[in-house]
Interface confidence: medium
């Protein structure tokens, strides 16, 4: 309706205020100046606009900033952020951690949306690496964030950032991700003493190689079964019965309950039954006495 395109007399918005919640969509379109909206974005979030009204406000900003919103506007988007598409967000250049926090706050308590994932991606790429402050912020809002990154993306995490990682942040990480994170953690915690070091490194051990597990077995660390079960199978297989006994300490008894599961099952198959019997746990499936064990991988390496 053409006659509705002009702003009715006396309705031109001089500021973004609560009177606008009573404007019809076409009145908002006609009576609110986009530049005024951009300078008073911080007010929008304090006013209970309907979703339909927010659509109109977004449209006005899109017209004003076709190349993407400036950060001064982005920081104050508030609930309008939920109206943005990943395509919109890809046009942004977000550099301030405060802006990132403000937008994550809007989505707090919900699963990571495609919008949030795109926002984080833009932010991290803009910074060049996943620094400690950013990681602190992201894992506070999304504990599983770290495990959502590819090994390639994780490679940009500096060792110093590892201090911000909590055990629960790694719950959903797969071995490939832990392979990348473990060396960084080892580097980050290298100056800590034995027991303190183990407490910090424990969550990352799913990426540890055999030689590091052997070293840990000499330090009376008493690794729990849950941690042991997350170790790389290829790292556990070469460990001797004596090393596993030292590594687990009192938790060694738990091997019986896990004897049918990896990596325990595969490790048992590699041990001499005599050695397994010394544990007194009734573990079965080891190599019978008198059998010769050929390490084919070593043979291949020599040929």
């Amino acid at each position: 309706e053409v006659e509705k395109t002009a702003c009715p007399s006396g309705k031109k918005a001089r500021e973004i205020d609560e009177s606008l919640i009573f404007y019809k969509k076409w009145e908002l379109e006609a009576c609110v100046d986009a530049a005024l909206l951009a300078t008073q974005m911080d007010r929008v979030n304090a006013i209970p606009f309907t979703y339909e009204q927010l659509d109109v406000l977004k449209h006005k900003l899109d017209e004003l900033y076709p190349q993407g919103y400036p950060e001064s506007v982005i920081q104050h988007l508030g609930y309008l952020f939920l109206k943005m598409s990943p395509e919109d967000i890809r046009k942004w250049n977000v550099t301030s951690l405060e802006t990132l926090k403000a937008l994550l706050e809007v989505n707090k308590g919900h699963e990571m949306s495609p919008q949030v994932a795109t926002l984080i991606d833009r932010f991290v790429k803009g910074r060049g690496q996943l620094d400690k402050d950013t990681l602190d912020t992201l894992t506070a809002f999304y504990p599983g964030y770290l495990c959502s990154l590819s090994p390639e993306e994780l490679s940009s995490v500096p060792p110093s950032s590892i201090w911000a990682v909590r055990p629960q942040d790694l719950d959903t990480c797969d071995p490939r991700q832990l392979d990348v994170l473990y060396p960084k953690a080892r580097l980050a915690f290298q100056n800590m003493n034995g027991s303190e070091y183990f407490v910090k490194i424990q969550s990352f051990l799913g990426g540890a190689p055999t030689e590091d597990l052997k070293a840990l077995s000499q330090q009376n660390v008493s690794m729990d079964l849950a941690t042991f079960m997350k170790l790389r199978t290829d790292a556990v297989l070469p460990l001797t019965v004596a090393e596993v006994q030292k590594l687990l300490g009192p938790h060694v008894e738990g091997l019986k309950a896990e004897e049918r599961h990896r990596p325990v099952r595969d490790w048992i198959l590699r041990q001499r039954q005599d050695d397994l019997d010394t544990l007194g746990l009734g573990l079965q499936g080891g190599i019978p006495n008198g059998y010769l064990v050929l390490d084919l991988s070593m043979q291949e390496a020599l040929s």
Epitope: G10, K11, F22, D42, A46, I47, P48, Y79
Partner: antibody
Framework: EVQLLESGGGLVQPGGSLRLSCAAS????????MSWVRQAPGKGLEWVSG????????YYADSVRGRFTVSRDNSKNTLYLQMNSLRAEDTAVYYC?????????WGQGTLVTVSS | QSVLTQPPSASGTPGQRVTISCICS????????VSWYQQLPGTAPKLLIY???KRPSGVPDRFSGSKSGTSASLAISGLRSEDEADYYC???????????FGGGTKLTVL
């Protein structure tokens, strides 16, 4: 200059009725939501009712719902509050205020006393 | 009992900075703006802060407001004797579909 002037207060018996008016000037009355707020003697502020510019929906505090009715006449720039079945606890100074989320202008108030 | 809780009283000496808190016990106010009102003895209330932190023209910059999560606060710096008044916070409650005020804080300038 924005001005809000309440009238219609006075002494009324419990169960009685009263109609308050608020004459507005200095702004485009038909563009803004309006509200009634009251304050019992020595007590804090209590929101009573709110009405949007087009009278589309009306909002009431639980304590007055079903007894009070808010209305407005945009052609007369006037806000009204019809109060029925008045109780002793309705005794208060009644203020009209501009807006519904942040009351940027207030009248001077009119005293309503409900007593036998 | 109000869903907005304020301390009943606060005090300070001239020149001091005082802060009045407003704690919200309803999640329905979380996303809505908080306003602050000053009521001098024997007068109608006056809007002091709106949209959490905005000052209407004419209100000195000694008055400032902030809001974080379910808590809002009003700060008054360089306290003056004329600041002695009752202060109320208020916000729209989306579940009640109505406006709520805090119980008010009586500020005394010693």
């Amino acid at each position: 200059e924005v001005q809000l002037l309440e009238s219609g207060g006075g002494l009324v018996q419990p169960g009685g009725s009263l109609r308050l008016s608020c004459a507005a000037s200095g702004f485009t009355f038909s563009n803004y939501a309006m509200s009634w707020v009251r304050q019992a003697p020595g007590k804090g502020l209590e929101w009573v009712s709110g009405i949007p510019p087009d009278s589309g929906s009306k909002y009431y505090a639980d304590s007055v719902r079903g007894r009070f009715t808010v209305s407005r006449d945009n052609s007369k720039n006037t806000l009204y509050l019809q109060m029925n079945s008045l109780r002793a606890e309705d005794t208060a100074v009644y203020y009209c205020a501009k807006n519904m989320l942040s009351f940027d202008y207030w009248g001077q108030g009119t005293l309503v006393t409900v007593s036998s | 009992q109000s869903v907005l809780t304020q301390p009943p009283s606060a005090s300070g000496t001239p020149g001091q900075r005082v802060t009045i808190s407003c704690i919200c016990s309803s999640s329905n106010i979380g996303s809505n703006a908080v306003s602050w009102y000053q009521q001098l003895p024997g007068t109608a209330p006056k809007l002091l802060i709106y949209y959490n932190s905005k000052r209407p023209s004419g209100v000195p910059d000694r008055f400032s407001g902030s809001k974080s999560g379910t808590s809002a606060s009003l700060a008054i710096s360089g306290l003056r004797s004329e600041d002695e008044a009752d202060y109320y916070c208020g916000s729209w409650d989306s579940s009640l579909n109505g406006y709520v005020f805090g119980g008010g804080t009586k500020l005394t300038v010693l």
